[in-house]
Amino acid sequence: IVLRPSRVHNSEENTMRALTLKDILNGTFSYKTFFPNWISGQEYLHQSADNNIVLYNIETGQSYTILSNRTMKSVNASNYGLSPDRQFVYLESDYSKLWRYSYTATYYIYDLSNGEFVRGNELPRPIQYLCWSPVGSKLAYVYQNNIYLKQRPGDPPFQITFNGRENKIFNGIPDWVYEEEMLATKYALWWSPNGKFLAYAEFNDTDIPVIAYSYYGDEQYPRTINIPYPKAGAKNPVVRIFIIDTTYPAYVGPQEVPVPAMIASSDYYFSWLTWVTDERVCLQWLKRVQNVSVLSICDFREDWQTWDCPKTQEHIEESRTGWAGGFFVSTPVFSYDAISYYKIFSDKDGYKHIHYIKDTVENAIQITSGKWEAINIFRVTQDSLFYSSNEFEEYPGRRNIYRISIGSYPPSKKCVTCHLRKERCQYYTASFSDYAKYYALVCYGPGIPISTLHDGRTDQEIKILEENKELENALKNIQLPKEEIKKLEVDEITLWYKMILPPQFDRSKKYPLLIQVYGGPCSQSVRSVFAVNWISYLASKEGMVIALVDGRGTAFQGDKLLYAVYRKLGVYEVEDQITAVRKFIEMGFIDEKRIAIWGWSYGGYVSSLALASGTGLFKCGIAVAPVSSWEYYASVYTERFMGLPTKDDNLEHYKNSTVMARAEYFRNVDYLLIHGTADDNVHFQNSAQIAKALVNAQVDFQAMWYSDQNHGLSGLSTNHLYTHMTHFLKQCFSLSD
């Protein structure tokens, strides 16, 4: 199925040019999306091209500049947040990145009613997190690992926590491992719906081993970065959840929410918090051995000013074939009765589907079913449930938005997006206004992305928010590669693949093949999305065929495929890449003497193992920031899939699945190993150990490090990286420069 057919006739071909590496590095063909910043059922904010903050009212069609670019510029603001009472805006400047989601910044509060910055009781700097209450203009913020509360922006702050300490106690913000592997946010505090209560997590990292690495900087001596980072089997953070009444914060102070007994009996994690009403909260907990999750609904006891979590309101989710959930355990979406909820989990056939839980999980009513998966619940209203799935036409790499009418019986299902722009748009996400009065659809491809606004009642398209016209025009004279998404059936396993083919692809010719792999548990690489990136250039200009394959362990095709890698990382992911390569060779247009594989992070691990598989299939390959041993990676992630590195658990496979154990097998391949020295995520240690093992085995290899760069290898390093990898591949494939 050719998803991006060439738009060219032969007569026009001489006016067309191939993509260049410069195009990719300059971001010449990047696209824009439009996500409205909803502030009501019919209004949203958007930062205009000239940096004014504009409020749009869909119903009246009017727009209002609520904050001028002049005001934004006066404090060098790069972000903003309107208070729910619309009296104030916080302006964020001096952005300083920390980890994946976290950053610190300076915050200024601007009073919209008098057009002046709030003076007196200004916020300290730098702040780790700041947010408005959902109603009014209370402020909660985290400074130096402690939480503070302001009733109004100009008021003095009330300090909620006092024990915060760098790298020891984190209040209202996650530590490294919770940020990266559990919460996927920079915050760990949650306002109740009307701002009466504030819940927060406290993470105690006192006993966690510390990863230390040098940051070279420009000084005479490098400084050492220390991060409490629990690797597999190590001591984990200790988490506690507290709730404070923000109206009278000093009255009883923070109240701890009890942990369910079946969770508290051994090491555990807190996984998410969902407010239901101002006086009901839902917490999710997970055993350290991550196949048991407990959802606990707790109620405020006015008489005792405490939170009560009755056992009758505990819902257990357990996996017998793998870990609980997909990548994370799904979160509940509560219905209007404030006790029943909708949640995605595996059905009896092993497909993730929406279930409605009224009393017990055992009595859950299955809302969706089929040999496909429900992926996200966007919104539940009185009469509709909006969700995304990959059901349509049985392509796992697509995402369409569906509406189920829950107000009527039997519920009826409608695909909102399936036939909107069928060729252009097969991968959607959505963003809903209050009460789903309106919603924005963001289509990511396979054609040029487009964002549109829709009526939440009729699903009628109201207007195009962003259609990337300039990109469309810029691509008119570019010879883009062709892309196809197909599947291989091998030994009862379906291997979906995406193949990126040179513009003048001819099946009778032979082409070098590059496999791009990620392959991590619950990931998906074969998606119907638009991209003009490095591999597009390699196909367009350098005439390579590039393939991406979703093997065992990948997501959204059922538990059989997903959980196949449970406790056995590094085996089937690699096997399936190799199997796919053999099938590609059989197709007749691959030059089997010129096959390479590359990947980043988990993909670096898989590419390394594939190169060291001893098959003789690969001439060369690249590993960027690879994991080399699961003993070196974070506990939360690693143990989810591998269990513990102990003798009585899974130590043997931890040892067997290292890259170092296969050092000898790199002798007959060209290997390029790349890593940033300041990688907080997959530590440089991983590549250092690979290099040491290769040296000890007297195996030649190439390597590149990026000083002071993290897992993303951003900025100028990106240009250097892709230039370097291009040279390596062209040399490997004997392509002239």
Epitope: G41, T60, Q62, S63, Y64, I66, D85, Q87, L112, S113
Partner: antibody
Framework: QVQLVQSGAEVKKPGSSVKVSCKAS????????INWVRQAPGQGLEWMGL???????NYNQKFQGRVTITKDNSTSTAYMELSSLRSEDTAVYYC?????????????WGQGTLVTVSS | DIQMTQSPSSLSASVGDRVTITCKAS??????VAWYQQKPGKAPKLLIY???YRYTGVPSRFSGSGSGTDFTLTISSLQPEDFATYYC?????????FGQGTKVEIK
């Protein structure tokens, strides 16, 4: 600071028209709606209509065909014209600022213009 | 049109009293209700918008609540300068409509 200054009192004959002006300062008419509200002697408040930031209008059905609201952004002045005047149109007419920051409630009021319709 | 019915139409109270004025909408107006204060010979002044948000500079003794069809304006401790007429208004849809007013007089 924000101000809405209205034109002076008017005495009009039944059947004639009146045009009340409202000069805005401290804000731009391209960024706020201007509403017109009237109050008959000893009576309550009655919303007549508005002119949006973009220049579009919305009128109370009760006045449809008789009221016209316009504005001149360059002079920051809004106007309300009421035709076919009757004695019951005797009232104080207010121009009032509205906008999204107060959920389209009416936050700044002019001082009012008394229009007397009398033969 | 949406009708706004205010009650009482007048009330007598003393300084320091807690005063409550209610307003009922003929249909659901969500939280789009504002309250105004008007003194004789003067233009009305905005007190509360979106049912519960106090407008800038309005004393904290004034508070608003409600959603849907039932709304309340409360003056927690009546001050001499609070004797005036109070109006509710829905700003949910056009035409914007006002309640008939509540006159707060000195007892």
């Amino acid at each position: 600071q924000v101000q809405l200054v209205q034109s002076g009192a008017e005495v009009k004959k039944p059947g004639s028209s009146v045009k009340v002006s409202c000069k805005a300062s401290g804000f731009s008419l391209t960024n706020y709606d201007i509403n017109w509200v009237r109050q008959a002697p000893g009576q309550g408040l009655e919303w007549m209509g508005l002119i949006w930031t973009g220049g579009g209008t919305n009128y109370n059905q009760k006045f449809q065909g008789r009221v016209t609201i316009t504005k001149d952004n360059s002079t920051s002045t809004a106007y309300m014209e009421l035709s076919s005047l009757r004695s019951e149109d005797t009232a104080v007419y207010y121009c009032v600022r509205g906008g999204p920051l107060v959920w389209y409630a009416l936050d700044y009021w002019g001082q009012g213009t008394l229009v007397t319709v009398s033969s | 049109d949406i009708q706004m019915t205010q009650s009482p139409s007048s009330l007598s109270a003393s300084v320091g009293d807690r005063v409550t004025i209610t307003c009922k909408a003929s249909q659901d107006v969500s939280t789009a209700v504002a309250w105004y204060q008007q003194k004789p010979g003067k233009a009305p002044k905005l007190l509360i918008y979106s049912a519960s948000y106090r407008y800038t500079g309005v004393p904290s003794r004034f508070s608003g609540s409600g959603s849907g069809t039932d709304f309340t304006l409360t003056i927690s401790s009546l001050q001499p300068e609070d004797f005036a007429t109070y109006y509710c208004q829905q700003h949910y849809s056009n035409p914007r409509t006002f309640g008939q007013g509540t006159k707060v007089e000195i007892k």
